[in-house]
């Protein structure tokens, strides 16, 4: 049985994909199905993720590479790897305790996830309000009441989009 | 679906040579050491030699060594057996095999005979 | 090289029979040991790895035990299409081995 053998660290010629046994001489050996091992010159083998309920494998473990997940439509990812799952919210709402709820007067949410933010001030820049915020679209601000003088042109925007069917908020 | 399928068997008379290939789908080769393992009519399953996944790292049966070179070729997503001075005893179907030995390909027979 | 030895070498049993089968290894595996099902003309079938874990879409009546040196594979109740070539194989070091065979036919 032919091998190569290092002058320095054996393990060091253990692949990825294998592991190094201590007491054995450190002889290589396979990880075993639904392990694996990234790097070279490991003592073990690691045990592959399983992406199981809420979970869908998004890349299939290999010998030398762990499994990644994700989440099954209606839930999105938080934490490193993604390492949890949280339910979608539609926009205009945030997730609390109880479930998703509306944001409240003043904030916005234009995503699935995440919590309701409050409108941008204005003023606070000196501008004014172009168009009104809602639960899912922050306030446009526009230039401020100053910079509307007699002879300056005016600018007229665009009336936000609305869904067919749905009334005016 | 994993599928691992060798080919590029035959009859070859001692003293020749064959290349084996095997052509592996449903999953990332590249990622996957391998392994080619044997088996001669009517005998139990003999291990041949290894691949690492990039294929650094090689291993070799005694009762091949120096007459078999195993490679790989990832971008072709394909595993190779170069077989030389062929014997008698050589006569198999020879198998090839993720690292994991969970999926294995249907073989292809090699005959050494005169 | 670990040199694993199995027995019985025939098995002769009815269907709804229980099955076991033994592998023993020259020297201590630790739990790298793996079960196989090869039926004629087919590749051999991954059903147990790591002595005791049954692979992916193996039905429950298979099960592994053992550790070091001594393991067995239990079949609970014997169905038809269990009938086949068992091989214990060991990767707990290269180079990799396997045992010669237990083959389970109908009584």
């Known amino acids: 049985f032919e091998r190569t053998r290092s002058l320095q660290d054996p393990c060091s010629n253990c692949p990825a994909g294998t592991f190094c046994d201590n007491n054995r001489n450190q002889i290589c050996s396979p990880c075993p199905p639904n392990s694996f091992s990234s790097a070279g010159g490991q003592r073990t083998c690691d045990i592959c993720r399983q992406c199981k309920g809420v979970f869908r494998t998004r890349k299939e473990c290999s010998s030398t590479s762990n499994a990644e997940c994700d989440c099954t439509p209606g839930f999105h990812c938080l934490g490193a790897g993604c390492s949890m799952c949280e339910q979608d919210c539609k926009q205009g709402q945030e997730l609390t305790k109880k479930g998703c709820k509306d944001c409240c007067f003043g904030t916005f949410n234009d995503q699935k996830r995440g919590i309701c933010r409050p409108w941008t001030n204005c003023s606070l820049d000196g501008k004014s309000v172009l168009v009104n915020g809602t639960k899912e679209r922050d306030v446009v601000c526009g230039p401020s009441p100053a910079d509307l003088s007699p002879g300056a042109s005016s600018v007229t925007p665009p009336a936000p989009a609305r869904e067919p069917g749905h009334s005016p908020q | 679906e994993v599928q691992l399928v060798e080919s590029g068997g035959g009859l070859v008379q001692p003293g020749g040579s064959l290349r084996l290939s095997c052509a592996a789908s449903?999953?990332?080769?590249?990622?996957?050491?391998m392994h080619w393992v044997r088996q001669a009519p009517g005998k139990g399953l003999e291990w041949v030699s290894y691949?690492?996944?990039?294929?650094?790292?090689?291993y070799y049966a005694d009762s091949v060594k120096g007459r078999f070179t195993i490679s790989r070729d990832n971008a072709k997503n394909s595993l190779y057996l170069q077989m030389n001075s062929l014997r008698a005893e050589d006569t198999a179907v020879y198998y090839c095999?993720?690292?994991?030995?969970?999926?294995w390909g249907q073989g292809t027979l090699v005959t050494v005979s005169s | 090289e670990i040199v694993l030895t199995q027995s019985p070498a025939t098995l002769s049993l009815s269907p709804g029979e229980r099955a076991t089968l033994s592998c023993k290894a020259s020297?201590?595996?630790?739990?790298?040991v793996s079960w196989y099902q090869q039926k004629p003309g087919q590749a051999p079938r991954l059903l147990i790895y790591?002595?005791?874990n049954r692979y992916t879409g193996i039905p429950a009546r298979f099960s592994g035990s053992g550790s070091g040196t001594d393991f067995t594979l239990t079949i609970s109740s014997l169905e038809p299409e269990d009938f086949a070539v068992y091989y214990c194989g060991q990767s707990y070091s290269y180079p990799l081995t396997f045992g010669g065979g237990t083959k389970v036919e109908i009584k």
């Open positions: 095999a993720r690292d994991w030995v969970d999926y």
């Open positions: 790591g002595a005791s």
């Open positions: 449903g999953f990332t080769f590249s990622e996957f050491g």
């Open positions: 020297e201590n595996v630790g739990s790298y």
């Open positions: 691949i690492s996944s990039g294929g650094s790292t090689i």
